[in-house]
Amino acid sequence: EEELQVIQPEKSVSVAAGDSATLNCTVSSLIPVGPIQWFRGAGPGRELIYNLKEGHFPRVTAVSDPTKRNNMDFSIRISNITPADAGTYYCVKFRKGSPDVELKSGAGTELSVRAKPSAPVVSGPAVRATAEHTVSFTCESHGFSPRDITLKWFKNGNELSDVQTNVDPAGKSVSYSIRSTARVLLTRRDVHSQVICEVAHVTLQGDPLRGTANLSEAIRVPPFLEVTQQSMRADNQVNVTCQVTKFYPQRLQLTWLENGNVSRTEMASALPENKDGTYNWTSWLLVNVSAHRDDVKLTCQVEHDGQPAVNKSFSVKVSAHPKEQGSNTAAENTGTNERNIYGGSG
């Protein structure tokens, strides 16, 4: 009598997650009487996948009708494959008994599952950084198989090179994760810039997945401050302007101080955006020179995005000699970021 053979023709089968996998197995003889069982893995820890004899295996069906005696095909189909189904499957013939006696195993078929990576998620720094600083962005994607994957970073279409990428785990696994960090040097022009993390994988058929982050979430562009005085009006009032320019984000509070005392506080809102994404804001303060005997120190104090306040100060000189005054006297810069403005007390 010819020796029983259990034939698993495919050494490996690769299936896309969600599809069905067919694992082929034929036997050369139905003698002796006894069941065929399918296992994943070998040895004492093997997992029973299908038992023609009994049990409930909702995702597994016999390819051929096992109730036909002349049927020597014991192939199975596993539906709705997930990465967790990956492994080596063995078709095993038993002789009927108590317990059933294992007679012969097939050589095994390795099932690998092609699983798409999840959509890349890009996260930026927890706190904003100013221009000329370098910030880190991370990109993560999970659940893909096989392990081979390509990840690229772009800033405004240009590939970034300061990148560190890891695929985990290092050894064999049912699915893998990728984590990449890109270091990006910020410039004042980056409010409208975008970084893109692009993931390419065999399951994506050449159509990579992309995750994006806007640098607007990571950057802070501190304002420039300029204080100017308009011409003295006939009513002895001086119009002082504080120009706050090229800042981002919009969150900004401006406080006018007269001789150290708060005169007025304003919050920026609904400002028009510059082409580069930054904002400008101008605030005016009208100072009645005739109401002051002594010099007036005016300070424009700007608190931007929760950062320490930036000051620009003026000294308005109250003069008893109107002839000495200029109607629009040039500013005199001092070490304390002050400007001296001479006004007549008239």
Epitope: L30, I31, V33, E54, T67, K68, R69, G97, S98, P99
Partner: antibody
């Protein structure tokens, strides 16, 4: 339709012989283990004999050496040659098909009556 | 030989009842146990194999369980056509052996 039809039963004297036949239709008999089961009047079921797909044969102790099971593939038929019959062999004899991979009985014939009496 | 013992030998029940018949093997038979139904003057009908698998066409009111030496056949809601004699059988090794039968009668 899968069917088993027995024939050959009848009245026979103790020590006599009888050959039972079982004609199979709807399937290939040689692909299955086949069995004979009997039931004495008013009694329970008793397995008598079997023939495997490889031609291997099995018998219950009380019929060993007296009964012979065989099959004829060309006629898709199963036989039970009964010699040296005894009164205790009186029963309805059923031809039964063994299930696919574990030999669980699935198809039964209608039975044929064998009476051994003088 | 493996001895098969059924209990009870007879059982009276009413239509709609749930009944359980037990079968014990004299040694471990794995789950190679079958159940058959037989009505007077008729050939047995195969109900269950490998202790719990229903043969094609057998209604789901029949269920089997057990492994090793102790087995049960349960009929969930008796109908008039279910009153018959039921046999268990081991088929793990030759000679195959049957239980003595359980006669299910209408109360």
């Amino acid at each position: 339709e899968v069917q088993l039809v027995e024939s050959g039963g009848g009245l026979v004297q103790p020590g006599g012989s009888l050959r039972l036949s079982c004609a199979a239709s709807g399937f290939t008999l040689s692909s299955y283990d086949m069995h004979w089961v009997r039931q004495a009047p008013g009694k329970g079921l008793e397995w008598v004999s079997a023939i495997g797909t490889a031609g291997d044969t099995y018998y219950t102790g009380s019929v060993k050496g007296r009964f012979t099971i065989s099959r004829e593939n060309a006629k898709n038929s199963l036989y039970l040659q009964m010699n040296s019959l005894r009164a205790s062999d009186t029963a309805v004899y059923y031809c039964v098909r063994g299930g696919v991979w574990d030999d669980a009985f699935d198809i039964w014939g209608q039975g044929t009556m064998v009476t051994v009496s003088s | 030989d493996i001895q098969m013992t059924q209990s009870p030998s007879s059982l009276s029940a009413s239509v709609g009842d749930r009944v359980t018949i037990t079968c014990r093997a004299s040694q471990d038979i794995n789950n190679y146990l079958a159940w058959f139904q037989q009505k007077p003057g008729k050939a047995p009908k195969s109900l269950i194999y490998t202790a719990s698998s229903l043969h094609s066409g057998v209604p789901s009111k029949f269920s089997g369980s057990g492994s090793g030496t102790d087995f049960t056949l349960t009929i969930s809601s008796l109908q008039p056509e279910d009153f018959a004699t039921y046999y268990c059988q081991q088929y793990v090794s030759y000679p195959y052996t049957f239980g003595q039968g359980t006669k299910l009668e209408i109360k």
